[in-house]
């Protein structure tokens, strides 16, 4: 049994880091493998993660962490029984994938303006809380070419757009994702999408 693709890990910079790797053949990850991880800090204990299958030869493990500070570094040991398959380390602050925003809501009752709001996925005392920026994706269910991205570079989790920038009388969907420049993170996953029917009063044409 050998590791084909070494574990790569990302952290949500809060409580979970996710490590993925591939074995050289079909593996029952949860019965055959264990990923041990330990914070490099005084008196820190080693913890064991039981991996799950992620495709035939792929494994994934969710490492629980009580909290994260940017100096933290973890040692990682991948074991198959008594055999050490791989040894490495992981610094969560250098591999951050933020949590996805939640509670995306489209408010259509503001005179010909669409107000999209969502929730910051972090509590106020987390470092990322004040460092997230967002991308909002809006698309038409009827027209695949009607697909747009709005970059929200301010901290407030909201976006206002004129309803007239979208077509009237058809349904749209929106979703939002986040990233943090300070830690050069990857983008989060997209939030669940929300749907609304876009309608607004067309201005009278002058003849």
């Amino acid at each position: 049994m050998k590791v084909l693709q070494e574990p790569t890990c990302v952290s949500d910079y809060m409580s979970i880091s996710t490590c993925e790797w591939k074995m050289n053949g079909p593996t029952n990850c949860s019965t055959e493998l264990r990923l041990l991880y330990q914070l490099v800090f005084l008196l820190s204990e080693a913890h064991t993660c039981i991996p799950e299958n992620n495709g035939g030869a792929g494994c994934v493990c969710h490492l629980l962490m009580d909290d994260v500070v940017s100096a933290d570094n973890y040692t990682l040991d991948l074991w198959a029984g008594q055999q050490l398959l791989w040894k490495g380390s992981f610094k969560p602050s250098e591999h951050v994938k933020p949590r996805a925003p939640g509670n995306l809501t489209v408010h259509t009752n503001v005179s010909d303006t669409l107000l999209l709001t969502w929730s910051n996925p972090y509590p106020p005392d987390n470092y990322l809380y004040n460092h997230l920026t967002y991308a909002v994706n809006i698309w038409s269910e009827n027209d695949p070419a009607d697909f747009r991205i709005y970059n929200v570079t301010y901290l407030e989790p909201s976006l206002r757009i004129a309803a007239s920038t979208l077509k009237s009388g058809i349904s749209y969907r929106a979703r939002v994702r986040a990233w943090a420049q300070c830690y050069n993170t990857t983008w989060s996953e997209w939030s669940p999408s929300t749907k609304w029917h876009n309608s607004y009063r067309e201005p009278f044409e002058q003849h």
Partner: antibody
Framework: EVQLVQSGAEVKKPGASVKVSCKAS????????MHWARQAPGQRLEWMGS????????SYNQKFKGRVTITVDKSASTAYMELSSLRSEDTAVYYC??????????????WGQGTLVTVSS | DIQMTQSPSSLSASVGDRVTITCRAS??????LIWYQQKPGKAPKLLVY???TLAEGVPSRFSGSGSGTDFTLTISSLQPEDFATYYC?????????FGGGTKVEIK
């Protein structure tokens, strides 16, 4: 806005004790370590100890050999530092400072204004 | 206890100068290092934590680097308000200890 407000200056005789208070506001008092440090005139800062108000766990600098006691009153969001058997070299400005939610996150973004304790016969 | 040694203990510099202050730990503290700025009669102000993370509201002319035992605080272009004393502190276990300070004075 996080604020730490300390009690006023004290003048004490050698051998006496002093108790300095630090009232916290603007955050959840029980969720962060509270530390005490001091600075004698022209000297480096010196960490004295800390307490986690959530459960009362304390950690002390052994240099003070049981002379320092840190307590909290959770209902008043106030931390206290008592130093006993005072000597002239204990003359210093004493600071409270809010630490992190966990030990290795103990940097001090918020400090009290400082309390001058003078020990003189 | 982990000893923190700063150098120089003082330096003279002019506005616009690049200033570098070093801090050495007596043993490996990984990246668990903090920098503070202190002005006379005031409490210290947090500048950098975890060796290189800039605290909220700190100007980008300040930067921290290093890991293990050797650390550096750099001010890329000294401003009038930067004349102060700078302290390092480790937070790799207790007791927390501070460096002796570096006083940055006007040349």
């Amino acid at each position: 806005e996080v604020q730490l407000v300390q009690s006023g200056a004290e003048v004490k005789k050698p051998g006496a004790s002093v108790k300095v208070s630090c009232k916290a506001s603007g955050y959840t008092f029980t969720s962060y370590n509270m530390h005490w440090a001091r600075q004698a005139p022209g000297q480096r800062l010196e960490w004295m100890g800390s307490i986690y108000p959530g459960n009362g766990d304390t950690s002390y600098n052994q240099k003070f050999k049981g002379r320092v006691t840190i307590t909290v009153d959770k209902s008043a969001s106030t931390a206290y530092m008592e130093l006993s058997s005072l000597r002239s070299e204990d003359t210093a400005v004493y600071y409270c400072a809010r630490g992190g939610r966990l030990r290795r996150g103990d940097w001090f973004a918020y400090w009290g204004q400082g309390t001058l304790v003078t020990v003189s016969s | 206890d982990i000893q923190m040694t700063q150098s120089p203990s003082s330096l003279s510099a002019s506005v616009g100068d690049r200033v570098t202050i070093t801090c050495r730990a007596s043993e490996n503290i990984y990246s668990y290092l903090i920098w503070y700025q202190q002005k006379p009669g005031k409490a210290p102000k947090l500048l950098v934590y975890d060796a290189k993370t800039l605290a909220e509201g700190v100007p980008s002319r300040f930067s921290g680097s290093g890991s293990g035992t050797d650390f550096t605080l750099t001010i890329s272009s000294l401003q009038p308000e930067d004349f102060a004393t700078y302290y390092c502190q480790h937070h790799y276990g207790t007791p927390l200890t501070f460096g002796g300070g570096t006083k940055v004075e006007i040349k």
